[in-house]
């Protein structure tokens, strides 16, 4: 039996700059029941606060609702582990909510096979920004990637589309079924997970011309 090992703050993420969650990895428990508490202060302020919500985001996490989320403030976050034999504290993590956004994936992915005047076939992929994104006010601007592969293929082909919410994919094989997904990233944040997979079969009666 021993004091707990040092916990490590794994990551903090926000879906929308309005709320955020931090997760930690506990160290060893020293063979004893161990309690974990997350505390935080804001740079330039004296007060230290305890995590407002340990439940919403699951085990080893702290959820900061709108009421507790400020942008343009640096949070200094630590996790403390305590058991009968002693305690141990993580290294502090400095968090600016503006820089930890991981949005929901884009929505309303639509796939359509089309033809140019020269009979060249392409797949027209269109989507919308995630629901929370207030793109119009500039609160968020998103960059996007799409990925696609034929059902038989092992590897995805990735296309960066910048801020465009549509993309034309050329050189597809008639008779093949293609799977497509999209993801997005805000200016200062992280890529979302890949969104829901959509599939489409390229009809055989479309002739491909290179």
């Amino acid at each position: 039996q021993s004091p707990p090992g040092k916990p490590e703050i794994h990551k903090c993420r926000s879906p929308d700059k309005e709320t955020f969650t931090c997760w930690w990895n506990p160290g060893s428990d020293g063979g004893l029941p161990t309690n974990y508490s997350l505390t935080y202060s804001k740079e330039g302020e004296k007060n230290t606060y305890e995590c407002p919500d340990y439940k919403t985001s699951g085990p080893n996490s702290c959820f900061f609702s709108k009421q507790y989320t400020s942008i343009w403030k640096i949070y200094i976050i630590t996790v403390n582990a305590t058991n009968e034999m002693g305690s141990s504290t993580s290294d502090p993590l400095y968090v600016d909510v503006t820089y930890i956004v991981e949005p929901e994936p884009p929505r309303n992915l639509t796939l359509e096979v089309k033809q140019l005047k020269d009979k060249k076939t392409y797949l027209w992929v269109k989507w919308l920004p995630p629901t929370i994104t207030d793109v119009k006010t500039g609160w968020f601007t998103m960059e996007y990637e799409i990925r696609l592969k034929s059902e038989e293929a092992d590897e995805w082909e990735i296309h960066f589309t910048g801020h465009q919410t549509q993309f034309k994919v050329f050189d597809l094989y008639p008779g093949q079924k293609y799977l497509v997904q999209t993801r997005c990233k805000p200016d200062h944040g992280y890529w979302s997970r890949w969104g829901q997979e959509k599939s489409i079969e390229i009809p055989n009666d479309f002739t491909l011309k290179d």
Epitope: T141, E143, I158, H159, F160, T161, G162, H163, Q164, D187
Partner: antibody, heavy 120, light 107 residues
């Protein structure tokens, strides 16, 4: 006919700012990205960033991110690039270029270039 | 950032010659490669995008090939107006970067 017409040459002092304009015609301005690329005397091409006029989304080269702002005025189909805190090594020809409309990063039409000279 | 390396940096050739310029990316860029031609005092001109697609109005003596990390631009029969500097550029993801250029001169 697609055309990108840039503003005239500028001479600036170190520490000043410059704002270069790029007026587009011959196509739907909001459908294509506008890139900014510079070329120092006798040197190669350096990509600075791009803007998508449809939603003013931008992507900047990290090297310039703290000093550059790209904007558009869709009513006049004009893109602008402002570079702040100018240094002598910012002396270059600055080009605007149109992205090809599907693939973000290749540039199918270019402006004539704007020479910016930074000298005390 | 993805680095683009062109070779050779300069090259002398004669009208009618077949010329090849190569470009190597520091990581896989699939087919996201463009080639540009630039003449002194002028803006660059797009020749090829997506490694092998000729831009509108570009003569068929120009061709591009390659994928992944290794790419080539070939001019099948040099014309007097082809003497210029050529740049490759990846357009895979930001930041887009250019090669250092290949100056093609008259022998």
């Amino acid at each position: 006919e697609v055309q990108l017409v840039q503003s005239g040459a500028e001479v600036k002092k170190p520490g000043a700012s410059v704002k270069v304009s790029c007026k587009a015609s011959g196509y739907t301005f909001t459908d294509y990205n506008i890139h900014w690329v510079r070329q120092a005397p006798g040197q190669g091409l350096e990509w600075m960033g791009y803007i998508y006029p449809n939603n003013d989304g931008t992507g900047y080269n990290q090297k310039f991110k703290s000093r550059v702002t790209m904007t558009t005025d869709t009513s006049t189909s004009t893109a602008y690039m402002e570079l702040r805190s100018l240094r002598s090594d910012d002396t270059a020809v600055y080009y605007c270029a149109r992205g090809d409309g599907n693939y973000v990063g290749d540039m199918d039409y270019w402006g004539q270039g704007t020479t910016v000279t930074v000298s005390s | 950032d993805i680095q683009m390396t062109q070779s050779p940096s300069s090259l002398s050739a004669s009208v009618g010659d077949r010329v090849t310029i190569t470009c190597r990316a520091s990581e896989n860029i699939y087919s996201y490669l463009a080639w540009y031609q630039q003449k002194p005092g002028k803006a660059p001109k797009l020749l090829v995008y997506n490694a092998k697609t000729l831009a509108e109005g570009v003569p068929s003596r120009f061709s591009g090939s390659g994928s992944g990390t290794d790419f080539t631009l070939t001019i099948s029969s040099l014309q007097p107006e082809d003497f210029a500097t050529y740049y490759c550029q990846h357009h895979y993801a930001t930041p887009f970067t250019f090669g250092q250029g290949t100056k093609l001169e008259i022998k």
